[in-house]
């Protein structure tokens, strides 16, 4: 289980139309459910129940976004519509270039994601927990445009990313 270095950039627009960027670094782990490779895209939060819908109630996103899913406590969803791996697959089917799970409330999900799948996803499936997860979810819920870059080595220079 390799460390995933996640850099999240929050874009805030000023009244003048300029953008200010705020960069936050956090770490997670690549799970065996997906590939250990880099990915980058706009963050889209996905509700674990929303992933149950087969009939795409909302627009399908263009390919290349990073899905963020905060998993529930298992007792709140005793009969989940999909396994955690199934939710990752559903997100990738809908165009996610990577999926990040916040497993803080459901640490059992780590084992589920690491049960060596015969057919792992070709995109990275990362999990975060604790302080890193709190940081991520606070950014995701700020209602600003945010992008995530996932790497399997520490970022070198913060200036080299997100050339807009």
């Amino acid at each position: 289980k390799e460390t995933a270095f996640v850099e999240v950039v929050l874009f805030e627009s000023s009244p003048s139309g300029d953008y200010t960027t705020y960069t936050t670094g956090l770490t997670g782990r690549f799970s065996r459910a997906g590939a250990t490779l880099s990915a980058e895209g706009e963050i889209v939060q996905m509700h674990p129940l929303g992933l149950c819908n087969n009939n795409d109630e909302e627009d399908l996103y263009e390919y290349g976004w990073v899905g963020v899913v905060k998993l529930e406590q298992p007792e709140l969803d005793p009969k989940p519509c999909l396994t955690v791996l199934g939710k990752a697959k559903r997100a990738v089917q809908r165009g996610a270039t990577a999926v990040i799970f916040d497993v803080s409330e459901n640490p059992e999900a780590i084992d589920q994601l690491n049960q060596g799948s015969e057919d792992p996803l070709k995109r990275p499936v990362v999990y975060v927990k604790g302080a890193d997860a709190i940081k991520l979810m606070n950014i995701v819920n700020k209602q600003k445009v945010a992008r995530a870059r996932i790497q399997h080595r520490p970022p070198r220079q913060p200036t080299e990313y997100f050339d807009m």
Epitope: Q45, M46, H47, G50, L51, E57, E58, D59, E72, K142
Partner: antibody
Framework: QSLEESGGGLVQPEGSLTLTCTAS?????????MCWVRQAPGKGLEWVAC????????TYYANWAKGRFTISKTSSTTVTLRMTSLTAADTASYFC????????????????WGPGTLVTVSS | DIVMTQTPASVEAAVGGTVTINCQAS??????LAWYQQKPGQPPKLLIY???NLESGVPSRFKGSGSGTQFTLTISDLECADAATYYC???????????FGGGTEVVVK
């Protein structure tokens, strides 16, 4: 950015009414929800219905509103609420509100509200 | 559907004082809770989202906290302009719907 409701007024019991919400300076193509929330005189807020402004146009209703109320996006700047089989219990101020897009499968909180339009159901 | 229970229904406090409003969800909604202020004859105004994030332009005297099923709105250094009715709202899932609490009237003496 602003929202304005119209179409309220006095209606007979079992009658019908269509409310319209007109948006100014709002891009309906951006992911968001347009919703109706009502408030009976001297009472609290009650969610009625929402429509997703993206191309899917998915609609969501409070359980009590299903079958009687219909929310629609009628143009790039207007949303309507068609209300049928009205009773005195439907007497309220009806607010149009814009819901922030939180993510796929989430509901929304309301960042922008219209001033409201009063609907009175009485004979 | 989620049911939001707000307490107390009414609270009175002096200028400069502090009031605490509680909101309880019938099931866990994580941190997906908003708080609104409504004055007579006006539409509601968003104060806080994601349980504790202050909406732009809202004074830091307003503080939201909590997660899961228990949430609190605390207003400190009360001003006369804070006299209003406050509502909590869950926005957990489009499947479970949108739900408001019953409201809490804040009277400032």
């Amino acid at each position: 950015q602003s929202l304005e409701e119209s179409g309220g007024g006095l209606v007979q019991p079992e009658g019908s009414l269509t409310l319209t919400c007109t948006a100014s300076g709002i891009d309906f193509s951006a992911r968001s929800y347009m919703c109706w929330v009502r408030q009976a005189p001297g009472k609290g807020l009650e969610w009625v219905a929402c429509i997703y402004t993206g191309s899917s146009g998915s609609t969501y209703y409070a359980n009590w509103a299903k079958g009687r109320f219909t929310i629609s996006k009628t143009s790039s700047t207007t949303v309507t609420l068609r209300m049928t089989s009205l009773t005195a219990a439907d007497t309220a101020s009806y607010f149009c509100a814009r819901g922030a897009y939180v993510g796929y499968g989430f509901a929304a909180y309301f960042t922008l509200w219209g001033p409201g339009t009063l609907v009175t159901v009485s004979s | 559907d989620i049911v939001m229970t707000q307490t107390p229904a009414s609270v009175e406090a002096a200028v400069g004082g502090t009031v605490t409003i509680n909101c309880q969800a019938s099931q866990s909604i994580s941190s997906y809770l908003a708080w609104y202020q409504q004055k007579p004859g006006q539409p509601p105004k968003l104060l806080i989202y994601y349980a504790s994030n202050l909406e732009s332009g809202v004074p830091s005297r307003f503080k939201g906290s909590g997660s899961g099923t228990q949430f609190t709105l605390t207003i400190s250094d009360l001003e006369c302009a804070d006299a209003a009715t406050y509502y909590c709202q869950a926005y957990y899932s489009s499947i479970t719907g949108w739900a408001f609490g019953g409201g809490t009237e804040v009277v400032v003496k």
